[in-house]
Interface confidence: medium
């Protein structure tokens, strides 16, 4: 699947962590699942959710760990760069993403206080941006040893392997199918209404359509609501407002990779939702 | 003081190139980005790109990317810009301008007027 | 590209008169910027971070707005504020600048 292709670092810096946080903390992403996590308190980079139990070489998580110490480095190095002004967040957004041809196109970006104001130029070999912010942190990062060099190895070599190693030894997780459980309830709402919520839990990939219909006609789609769970899968409702007494000629229809075909579902009976 | 220092007016025929200066001093020229900016007769001001003279990383304005070339001489505080295969359009005010300390162009050259006539 | 798009093109107003001219951008940008140009010289920093005055500029100028919406006023028009107000933004790439608004003197 297209959107499996790519291995994205989400990395995050604060300049004035609260008291026992962390001042640096990054997700790593295989496609939409997030397969690796590490903060500065910690210190190590370790797997989440379903990668736990992927047969990676055993020095894997050591280079991980390295290579985003280094970051850790350089990303507070930053604030030093700035000066004592702030407080400052720092985000960077690095990885790389497998084209149709299997070659690899690179990304690094970064944001200050959730503005874009620099970026990683790998055929110029140094980061790049004319905010004054940007010179200061880029010749902080410059000065750092072979810091530009490692950048590009770990943009132009590191990512695009490791993506490659992940696609061979993680398949299983990358097409890991889990299909929704299901409930549609009916709440009273507003005098002479009621809500409707069409709820889907535990499901993967995250792509999910939930729809209504009316006798068999289409109502539309609701108001949604959608998110992850701690294990990596997703959940997500929607609701819609219909007249009470109505609600029986409702049912919801959810459409998902891991279901065969689009699956209704019926308003549950006020005893089984109590 | 500050002050950004451009090179006079040129006159140039079509299809020519045409290479202007923008010597900077009363600052560390290292320490700011230097932009430039064009400026056709009787219209408004257009970005081209910028140069970061301490590592010559360059930025164009994609519109700009094959007919500007920006960069820059440490040593001398100087900081050029090249126009090639000029055309009639080419005919403008060229302001180099230094980005300050708030994300601004706080200082700009006097300009470098360019004609391009056959 | 961030297509900053200035209103009115053209404004004449007398002396002591209240000015506001408007910056529209076809994105949100987070800061606005403002810039003077008089006839025959380089443009002049006027506001930073859409209303930060900048050195030396007369308390007179002002500068506000969010988003996609921006503006500059003079609140009392003087001889020597007859110029061409351009607005840009640093928000993203390429740079751009507005068309301008000249402002003339009745």
């Known amino acids: 699947a297209e959107s499996h292709l790519s291995l994205l670092y989400h990395l995050t810096a604060v300049s004035s962590p609260a008291p026992g946080t962390p001042a640096f903390w990054v997700s790593g992403w295989l496609g939409p699942q997030q397969y690796l996590s590490y903060n500065s308190l910690r210190g190590e980079a370790e797997p989440c959710g379903a990668w736990v139990w992927e047969n990676q070489v055993s020095w894997y998580w050591e280079k991980e760990t390295t290579d985003l110490r280094i970051k850790e480095k350089l990303f507070l190095e930053a604030f030093k760069a700035l000066g004592g002004k702030g407080p400052y967040t720092l985000q960077g957004l690095l990885g790389c993403e497998l084209g149709p041809d299997n070659t690899s196109v690179p990304t690094a970006k970064f944001a200050l206080n959730g503005e874009e104001f620099m970026n990683f130029d790998l055929k110029q070999g140094t980061w790049g941006g004319d905010w004054p912010e940007a010179l200061a942190i880029s010749q902080r990062w410059q000065q750092q040893d072979k810091a530009a060099n490692k950048e590009l190895t770990f943009l132009l070599f590191s990512c695009p392997h490791r993506l490659r190693e992940h696609l061979e030894r993680g398949r299983g997780n990358l097409e890991w199918k889990e299909p929704p459980s299901m409930r549609l309830k009916a709440r009273p709402s507003s005098p002479g209404f009621s809500v409707l919520t069409c709820s889907a839990f535990s499901f993967y990939p995250p792509e999910l359509q939930l729809r209504f219909l009316r006798n068999g006609l289409a109502a539309g789609t609701g108001q949604g609501d959608f998110g992850p769970n701690s294990d990596g899968s997703f959940h997500a409702s929607s609701s819609l407002t219909v007249k009470s007494g109505d609600e029986h000629h409702y049912c919801c229809i959810v459409q998902h990779a891991g279901l065969a075909q689009p699956l209704r579902v019926e308003l549950e009976s006020p005893a089984k939702s109590s | 003081q500050i002050q950004l220092l451009q090179s006079g007016a040129e006159l140039a025929r079509p299809g020519a190139s045409v290479k202007m200066s923008c010597k900077a001093s009363g600052y560390t020229f290292t320490s700011y980005t230097m932009h430039w900016v064009k400026q056709r007769p009787g219209q408004g001001l257009e970005w081209i790109g910028y140069i970061n003279p301490s590592s010559g990383y360059t930025n164009y304005n994609q519109k700009f990317k094959d007919k500007a070339t920006l960069t820059a001489d440490k040593s001398s505080s100087t900081a050029y810009m090249q126009l090639s295969s000029l055309t009639s359009e080419g005919s403008a005010v060229y302001y180099c301008?230094?980005?300050?300390?708030?994300?601004?162009?706080?200082?700009w050259g006097q300009g470098t007027s360019v004609t391009v006539s056959s | 590209e961030n297509v900053l798009t200035q209103s009115p093109a053209i404004l004449s107003a007398s002396p002591g008169e209240k000015v506001t001219m408007t910056c529209s951008a076809s994105s949100s940008v987070s800061y606005m910027y403002w810039y003077q140009q008089k006839p025959g010289s380089s443009p002049r920093l006027l506001i930073y971070?859409?209303?930060n005055l900048a050195s030396g500029v007369p308390v007179r100028f002002s500068g506000s707005g969010s988003g996609t919406s921006y503006s500059l006023t003079i609140s009392r028009m003087e001889a020597e504020d007859a110029a061409t107000y351009y607005c840009q933004q640093w928000s993203s790439y390429p740079r751009t600048f507005g068309g301008g608004t000249k402002l003339e003197i009745k």
């Open positions: 971070d859409t209303s």
């Open positions: 301008a230094r980005s300050g300390l708030r994300r601004v162009l706080d200082y």
